[in-house]
């Protein structure tokens, strides 16, 4: 109604004795701004006068002046909207009705809020979730209809009396519709805080106990279990009994059901608490536990392995691989069902005892023929010794032996004559089935592992024949040793090995690849000059002159051949290479090892590659490798190749110790 | 065909350890023509090489200087993958962590993981 | 270590053009040098090696070229899956090190 002031505050306000209160208030006056103000405690009208009568806690007039007294109670409200109050230190007898006397030009009002004062404080109320259940998180809420500024206050949360280790979350309100102080804690309960206390503690700000709420959890979880077995290692033979016992040790509701679960699957009419097992087979060797229901759901015990044992029943031998190629490795395993596991094996080869093999394999790592035949065994356990089974045969395939090419006609063998060979071996599994000759020719093969030659040639200067299987064997080549003039004249430099450059000795050798007869003379030429009649031209010590294109001849009493020209450069691919090492060559494990390939090139060297003792290149292409932090085991030989634009070169291997530690040899 | 498959969590806290995985299907970790690299990638570093193991005639590692105190790389031959491990990590470690295999043949990454984006938060 | 310095940083450029992106190591690195492309949440993947051998499945409009400190990557003509970032990559000598990387960018 339009005569009215409105007001907006907490309908009551609620505090203990020593504490203080702290009232949110909004107001909107008739008309203009407030010119005086007074707080009554239990204000009474007066009909007589006219005016209320009360305790005036506060008072406000025009002049602005308030009696020194009046500093408990503040009015921190203005002329025209905020009506907002503190009392501090707030007593047992301020609680009742608390009036504010409000007026203004031309209105008045009276506004009543109650206060509520008790002489301890009050507890806060714990709020729980209507059901909890087992690993569910769930929202505890702590509500206190208490807060105010001047008088901090916090609530703890306690299970069983002990602080809570989960982070509450706590929320204060001062407004005009509500005043109170909640603290929320989310929590996943376990089925063990089934029955437990669970606190809120009210505490001031040196944490000093005020007042409490406490509740009992209701943790709705399935039913926990106990498996007990008789006899208690589980550990039987065929034909004992077990007997095995399901323990609830808690269940919240109560449980429904019960049942028996072998290996994940249920066990048909076993819907007790105890298991009785007679006269049991190794089929029933497994993985037994019970399930309990109840409205929550199943609960499942602790798995116990029943282990049936039994004596080894017949074996097998199982070979890995057959047939066998010699040289390869052989393993043999005898498979034999039983439990415990069999703690010893007896092995036969073509039925005779093999000594020394006790074991469940056999691993032979070079095959030979000799191994070939039939493997048995037979396994032992605790409980007596099996049958020996059937066996398993080994053979063991090999290329041909012994292979050698014969050549059939008289020696010498001259250009143009027809050359009969055969090729012969000494014993082969599989049997032989072909043959190959080298090298292929358009040749004749009149009969199996024979060779026919027509018209040979100059350059038929060896032969080898493989006999072939499976594999192929070759046999060492043998020279026809056919007479021709000198063939394949070169100049070859023969000193120095690497690259020339300028001041060297050289020797360059003139070089063919045969000759029969083998008596020659040889002749040397540059641009045309005849420089010597030797098979090597040297030069003591070589300059940039020197460099050009030089040719050798080669005469025997059948013609003269001519190399061709070759061209003598002072350039030279990387030599001299060597690996060094930084620190040293000995180097303790955990350091830092630098290895450098060191060479000399002209031009100079454009990359590098790395090499372990077992010749396997290392990912690296510059000059260093390093090792860091290095270890033991890369203790051994490397070696580098260097590569410019004419060619590599390779250093000789260099070897690197890495020792161990004075920390690791302590350990030891 | 040759594949790596990256396994760890993506967030980590900072001074704890980040522990990656990759496997590896049509190769081997023991292959003496490979090795097996680290690499991460972050706005403000770009493409960072962190370290290798590879297997010739025994295991070798290589690691990058900027985090050689804190880095192991180890290969699981039973498992035919390898690992990564950076400890004490700071939030300057956050990037996508990739593994790539290395060939001697093309000494380049021919094949790389999918990644894996790692915060240290 | 060796550093690697690629240019342009970034590059704008249409379907068809041919494209030139330049890679420059502080040291000679012979001829091992690798190019990767790279597309937004993808890991990279390896267009050339050794300075000039495509890899695998790599269309053939990409070519690698040079030697020592200066290498190039050049696509002859732009394809619309050919937008992304491109590195460059030395394998020479440890640490393994990368480009920063140049930004294709449709114009």
């Known amino acids: 109604d339009s005569s009215k002031w409105v007001f907006e505050h907490p309908e009551t306000l609620y505090a203990w004795e020593g504490a203080c209160v702290w009232i949110p208030c909004t107001y909107r006056a008739l008309d203009g701004d407030l010119e005086s103000f007074i707080l009554f405690h239990n204000p009474e009208y007066n009909k007589n006068t006219s005016k209320f009568d009360g305790t005036r806690l506060y008072e406000s007039t025009k002049d602005g002046k308030v009696p020194s007294e009046q500093k408990r109670v503040q009015f921190l409200g203005d002329k025209n909207k905020n009506c907002t109050l503190s009392i501090h230190p707030v007593h047992l007898n301020d609680s009742g009705q608390l009036g504010l006397r409000m007026e203004s030009k031309t209105e008045k009002w009276m506004e009543r809020i109650h206060l509520n004062v008790s002489e301890r404080p009050f507890p806060p109320h714990i709020q729980l979730p209507p059901e909890i259940q087992e690993s569910q998180e769930v929202t505890l809420t702590c509500l206190l209809n208490f807060s105010c500024y001047g008088y901090p206050i916090q609530l703890q949360w306690l299970l069983e009396g002990v602080p809570m280790r989960q982070a509450a979350v706590t929320s204060t309100s001062l407004t005009i519709k509500s005043v109170f102080t909640r603290s929320e804690l989310k929590f996943s309960p376990q089925w063990s805080h089934h029955g437990k206390i669970v606190t809120c503690q009210l505490q001031d700000a040196d944490g000093k106990f005020l007042s409490n709420d406490t509740v009992q959890l209701n943790v709705k979880h399935t039913p926990k279990l106990e498996i007990k077995v008789t006899p208690s290692d589980a550990i039987v033979r065929e034909g004992d009994s077990v007997t095995m016992t399901c323990e609830v040790s808690s269940s919240n509701p109560e449980y429904t059901t019960v049942s028996w679960l072998k290996d994940g699957t249920s066990l048909k009419k076993q819907n007790t608490f105890t298991l009785n097992l007679r006269e049991v087979t190794k089929d029933q060797s497994g993985k037994y536990c019970c399930q309990v229901s109840n409205d929550v759901g199943p609960g499942r015990s602790e798995e116990v392995f029943l282990q049936v044992q039994y004596a080894p029943e017949p074996s097998t031998v199982q070979i890995l691989h057959s047939p066998a190629v010699e040289g390869s490795q052989v393993e043999f395993l005898c498979m034999s069902l039983a439990n415990p596991l069999p703690t010893n094996y007896t092995w036969y080869h073509n039925g005779k005892e093999m000594q020394g093999r006790t074991e469940e394999k056999v691993h032979i790592p070079k095959i030979l023929p000799w191994h070939a035949g039939t493997y048995s065994c037979v396994a032992e356990n605790i409980l007596g010794t099996g049958q020996r089974g059937p066996g398993a045969e080994l053979d063991v395939q090999y290329p041909p032996k012994k292979v050698t090419t014969v050549i059939q006609n008289p020696m010498p063998i001259r250009e143009g004559d027809t050359v009969t060979l055969s090729c012969n071996y000494n014993s082969s599994n599989p049997s032989v089935t072909r043959y190959e000759w080298k090298p292929h020719g358009a040749w004749e093969e009149p009969s199996l592992g024979v060779l026919k030659i027509q018209n040979v040639g100059w350059d038929n200067t060896t032969i080898a024949c493989a006999a072939c299987n499976s594999w192929c064997s070759w046999a060492s080549p043998v020279a026809l040793n056919v007479q021709y003039a000198p063939r394949d004249v070169r100049v070859r430099k023969i000193k120095p090995l690497s690259e020339i450059h300028s001041g060297n000795s050289v020797s360059l050798q003139c070089d063919f690849s045969s000759s029969h007869p083998k008596e020659v003379q040889f002749f040397w030429e540059k641009n045309g000059r005849l420089l010597g009649k030797e098979s090597q031209l040297n030069f003591d010590s070589i300059s940039p002159e020197d460099a050009g294109s030089y040719s050798c001849w080669v005469n025997n009493s059948i013609g003269q051949t001519a190399s061709k020209a070759w061209t003598l450069e002072v350039l030279y691919a990387p030599r001299r290479l060597r690996v060094s090492m930084s620190p040293g060559d000995q180097v303790m494990e955990g350091k830092s090892a630098t290895l450098t390939c060191e060479s000399d090139a002209n031009p100079p060297v454009s990359h590098y590659t790395w090499f372990d003792w077992n010749n396997q290149s290392l990912p690296y292409h510059s000059q260093k490798l390093r090792l860091e932090p290095v270890k033991v085991q890369h203790s051994g030989a490397y070696w580098c190749q260097g590569t410019n634009s004419v060619g590599k070169g390779r250093s000789p291997l260099s070897t690197l110790t890495v020792y161990y530690s004075p920390e690791t040899i302590g350990r030891r | 065909q040759v594949q790596l498959q990256q396994s760890g969590p993506g967030l980590v806290k900072p001074s704890q350890t980040l522990s990656l995985t990759c496997a590896i299907s049509?190769?081997?970790?023991?292959?003496?023509?490979?090795?097996w690299n680290w690499i991460r990638q972050s706005p403000s570093r770009g493409l960072e090489w962190l370290g290798r193991?590879?297997?010739?005639?025994?295991?070798?590692?290589d690691y990058a200087v900027s985090v050689k105190s804190r880095i192991t790389i180890n290969p699981d031959t039973s498992k035919n993958q390898f690992s990564l491990q950076l400890n004490s990590v700071t939030p300057e470690d956050t990037a996508v962590y990739y593994c790539?295999?290395?060939?001697?043949?093309?000494?380049?990454?021919?094949?790389w993981g999918q990644g894996t984006m790692v915060t240290v938060s | 270590d060796i550093q690697m310095t690629q240019s342009p940083s970034s590059l704008s450029a249409s379907v068809g053009d041919r494209v030139t992106i330049t890679c420059r190591a502080s040291q000679s690195i012979s001829s091992y040098l690798n190019w990767y492309q790279q597309k937004p949440g993808k890991a990279p993947k390896l267009l050339i090696y050794a300075a000039s051998s495509l890899q695998s499945g790599v269309p053939s409009r990409f070519s690698g070229s040079g030697s020592g400190t200066d290498f190039t990557l050049t696509i002859s003509s732009l394809q619309p899956e050919d937008f992304a970032t491109y590195y460059c990559q030395q394998s020479y000598s440890t640490p393994l090190t990368f480009g920063g990387g140049t930004k294709l960018e449709i114009k």
């Open positions: 790539a295999r290395e060939v001697s043949g093309t000494s380049a990454f021919d094949i």
């Open positions: 049509g190769d081997s970790v023991s292959s003496n023509s490979a090795a």
């Open positions: 193991t590879y297997y010739r005639s025994t295991w070798y590692n």
